[in-house]
Interface confidence: low
């Protein structure tokens, strides 16, 4: 290490801190009895500049004169070389060449501000240093400010440059003075326009007008008097990307024509005095404002379901999807549903608030049409019109070979083949899905998507949960009729968690009827494909017999006629999904009382 100079010393003259261009004398001397041998000529002293040899001498001391040292720190190390041994470090020294102040820059904040300059001090010499900042202007005017703080790198002249002669040149220079001497920065020359940085615009306001069907707004602000250029930036509050506009001689106002309705925007403005001189002001404070609503665009995606009630009545359930934010263009206050009997011409209009569905009961006779539109404070969207028809009535239009395959945890790929006939009549397909739910299904949400007539597959992912069975329908729709096919499908699935619970076994004319309770929906773990009924003689070690029944939603009983009379059997059931078989349900014993053949 440099500071462990046990064997000798390194001295530097005139000083270890020097001015750029100065010459230094470096000497290295051994302490008594620290050489290779008493004979001085066997002691070879070597001087290194960093890792490069620059001098050597046989004896107890070495002297070297060094010039041309660069700015910053240079390390010199003296080593002793003895015959047949490694070089031994004697001592070393760091020589610092002081840097002149650099990167002087000056700025005046605003037309009424004062000139202040900053600079880089350079590497610290640890010498007491005074800084003098000098500004000279036209007509031999000079201003001077001094700073006796060793760490000084900023001074404010306290003077205000005025625009009377904007092309007049000013020159600033900073000089550092310490015990070594003085060193000045390169001078910085500038004009009023170069260094005045305007204050950011203030008092920003926005005014909205209605011009044709586009929201036009005017942005107003106040600026300092000499500002020539402005740049505006604006964005929706939930966006990270700014739109930028440059304007010349705006005089505190600018029209914006491309704002989206019913959107909160952020606006900021910056100013500059000259096209190519000077610097931009800081951005102004942010103005936040919401653009006004405009009437909705786009049309609602509407679907419906029909349900037979009795010989004269049917229930129609309408469903529609929310408009996107860009289509709604405001807060949707209500949906307007119009129901019309085409033959009698009667019209019923109803405003629906807070729902995206509507159910009504209508006559089974007559032709009916519905129209649904969305309304905000400025108006209504174009209505979506649908003629109510029997969606599954046209067998020739039914898609065939419908399949549903798990694509991921939360999506199902539905594929189908076009109708065998009337292929050209198909205008679109609608794929509809809802959770399979035994019993009342009127409260179960309905999902759908539309697909063009050339598609024969659709990936459904909205409201798809794993381990859940969905009833999926594919409709082929023409101008005035529809055909449909249905299938059960699930995404991720497992074997059911439990088997059906046998709740009763009854005897009927020599066979038995087994009744069971459905497996709870949350334990089915997907679409059930089959039930299995197992039976074997009690106390027998033989393999059980089994009967496999295809799963049907409403079925919960099944006959078996292969049991022997007066033999006690044990019976149980399991359920299967495509992923496997459940564990067995409860066991029941039964003995058929009928006569033996």
């Amino acid at each position: 290490k440099i500071d462990e100079c046990k064997r000798g010393d390194v001295t530097v003259k005139p000083s270890r801190v020097i001015l750029l261009g100065s010459t230094v004398n470096i000497s290295c001397s051994l302490k008594p009895r620290q050489g290779c041998s008493p004979y001085s000529r066997r002691n070879k002293l070597i001087l290194y500049k960093f890792d490069r040899r620059i001098n050597f001498h046989h004896g107890h001391s070495l002297n070297a004169q060094v010039t041309g040292l660069p700015l910053g720190t240079t390390l010199f190390v003296c080593k002793l070389a003895c015959i047949n041994s490694d070089e031994i470090q004697i001592c070393g020294a760091e020589i610092l060449v002081g840097e002149q102040p650099q990167n002087l820059s000056c700025i005046q904040k605003g037309e009424q501000g004062t000139v202040a300059c900053t600079w880089e001090r350079g590497q610290d010499t640890h010498l007491y240093t005074e800084y003098t900042l000098q500004l000279s202007g036209p007509k031999n005017l000079t201003w001077q400010k001094q700073c006796k703080d060793h760490y000084c790198d900023y001074l404010d002249f306290g003077i205000n440059l005025t625009p009377e002669s904007p092309e007049s040149n000013f020159t600033a220079k900073v000089t550092a003075v310490n015990s070594l001497g003085s060193s000045s920065s390169f001078p910085s020359t500038f004009t009023f326009l170069d260094i005045v940085r305007p204050l950011p615009p203030w008092d920003i306001r926005i005014k909205f007008q209605k011009a044709s069907s586009v929201s036009r707004c005017t942005l107003y602000w106040r600026d300092e008097g000499l500002v020539l250029l402005n740049r505006l930036r604006y964005r929706p509050s939930n966006s990270r990307h700014w739109n930028m506009v440059n304007v010349t001689e705006a005089r505190g106002r600018h029209d914006l024509l491309d704002l989206k309705p019913f959107t909160e925007y952020e606006f900021q403005i910056s100013s500059k005095l000259h096209l190519y001189k000077g610097s931009w002001s800081d951005w102004s404070e942010t103005l936040r404002a919401q653009t006004p609503e405009e009437e909705p665009t786009g049309m609602l995606d509407v679907w419906y379901m029909k349900r037979h009630i009795d010989y004269s009545r049917q229930q129609i359930s309408l469903f529609w999807k929310n408009l996107s934010v860009s289509e709604a263009r405001g807060k949707i206050l209500h949906y307007q549903v119009t129901l019309q009997e085409l033959t009698g011409g009667k019209v019923m209009t109803q405003n629906i608030t807070g729902h995206t569905s509507w159910t009504t009961v209508i006559s089974r006779t007559g032709n009916w049409a519905v129209a649904v539109s969305a309304a905000n404070s400025k108006g209504n969207s174009l209505p979506t019109r649908i003629n109510i028809m029997n969606l599954c009535e046209a067998g020739l239009l039914a898609p065939h070979q419908v399949s549903a395959n798990s694509e991921s945890m939360d999506s199902i790929l539905v594929t189908w083949q076009p109708p065998r006939k009337d292929l050209s009549a198909v205008q679109e397909y609608v794929v509809e899905w809802r959770q399979l739910h035994p019993g009342d299904d009127t409260q179960i949400p309905l999902n759908w998507l539309r697909s063009p007539p050339y598609n024969v597959s659709a990936l459904i992912s909205e409201n798809i949960k794993p381990y859940t069975c969905y009833e999926i329908r594919v409709y082929a729709l023409s101008e005035d009729q529809g055909g449909c096919s249905s299938i059960l499908g699930n995404s991720e699935h497992k074997a059911p968690l439990s088997g059906p619970h046998i709740n009763a076994i009854t005897e009927e004319k020599g066979s038995i009827l087994i009744s069971w309770n459905s497996i709870p929906v949350q334990e089915q773990m997907g679409c059930l494909l089959h039930y299995r009924i197992y039976w074997k003689e009690r106390d027998s070690n033989s393999q059980p017999q089994l009967c496999e029944i295809p799963y049907r939603v409403s079925q919960n009983s099944h006959p078996i006629n292969s049991l022997q009379p007066r033999v006690t059997y044990v019976l149980w059931m399991t359920a299967l999904t495509a992923a496997g078989e459940s564990s067995q349900g409860n066991e029941r014993e039964f003995c058929l009382q009928g006569k033996a053949n």
Partner: antibody, heavy 117, light 106 residues
């Protein structure tokens, strides 16, 4: 799941500045509006303002002159500074996550700050 | 500045329907949210965007908003629903809370 936790001194002297930090854990601070809301003892809720993850802010006009909200996305934290406090600023201070449609779906547990000499 | 007005208190018998109103100028044109707060706890969102219910909030809570009034309806009120209820809306870039309503289940 995402959780919010307020931290800061429970006692502040009058005329000093109240400083609180809210740490968001279990999720990112990105793409939400983060707010400070207070509730004086036995009274209702008062909103201070929000900060978006980009640093843009919006303040309640009645408190704007005394309030600063800042965000440090690298630490998943945002902070409240309320200057020149008086006894009337004694309250439970909550941090909350807001959506673009201005409801608060996630709240911190709240921290009681008392202003007293 | 915009104000939302709520009744200070509402009482209801268990199993009955409770309605808490919140009124403000043209409130129907703004999105209303509702929170309940039990003693010593943070507020909890129960209705947002006038009618929507966050997951985990029972179906007995519903909301509506039109004209100058937003209404929180609790059907089949239970003892656990006793709390302070606050409405909230957004006006001129400011979040505004109602003064709160104490719901008492008798």
């Amino acid at each position: 799941q995402v959780q919010l936790q307020e931290s800061g001194p429970g006692l502040v002297k009058p005329s000093e500045t109240l400083s609180l930090t809210c740490t968001v854990s279990g999720g990112s601070i990105s793409s939400y509006y983060w707010s400070w809301i207070r509730q004086p003892p036995g009274k209702g809720l008062e909103w201070f303002g929000y900060i978006y993850d980009s640093g843009s802010t919006n303040y309640n006009p009645s408190l704007k002159s005394r309030v600063t909200i800042s965000v440090d996305t690298s630490k998943n934290q945002f902070s409240l500074k309320l200057s020149s406090v008086t006894a009337a600023d004694t309250a439970v201070y909550y941090c909350a996550r807001g959506s673009y449609f201005w409801y608060f779906d996630l709240w911190g547990r709240g921290t009681l700050v008392t202003v007293s000499s | 500045s915009y104000e939302l007005t709520q009744p200070p208190s509402v009482s209801v018998s268990p199993g009955q329907t409770a309605s808490i109103t919140c009124s403000g100028d043209k409130l129907g044109a703004k999105y209303a949210s509702w929170y309940h707060q039990k003693p010593g706890q943070s507020p909890v969102l129960v209705i947002y965007q006038d009618t929507k219910r966050p997951s985990g909030i029972p179906e007995r809570f519903s909301g509506s908003n039109s004209g100058n009034t937003a209404t929180l309806t609790i059907s089949g009120t239970q003892a656990m629903d006793e709390a302070d209820y606050y409405c909230q809306a957004w006006d001129s870039s400011t979040v505004v809370f109602g003064g709160g309503t104490k719901l008492t289940v008798l």
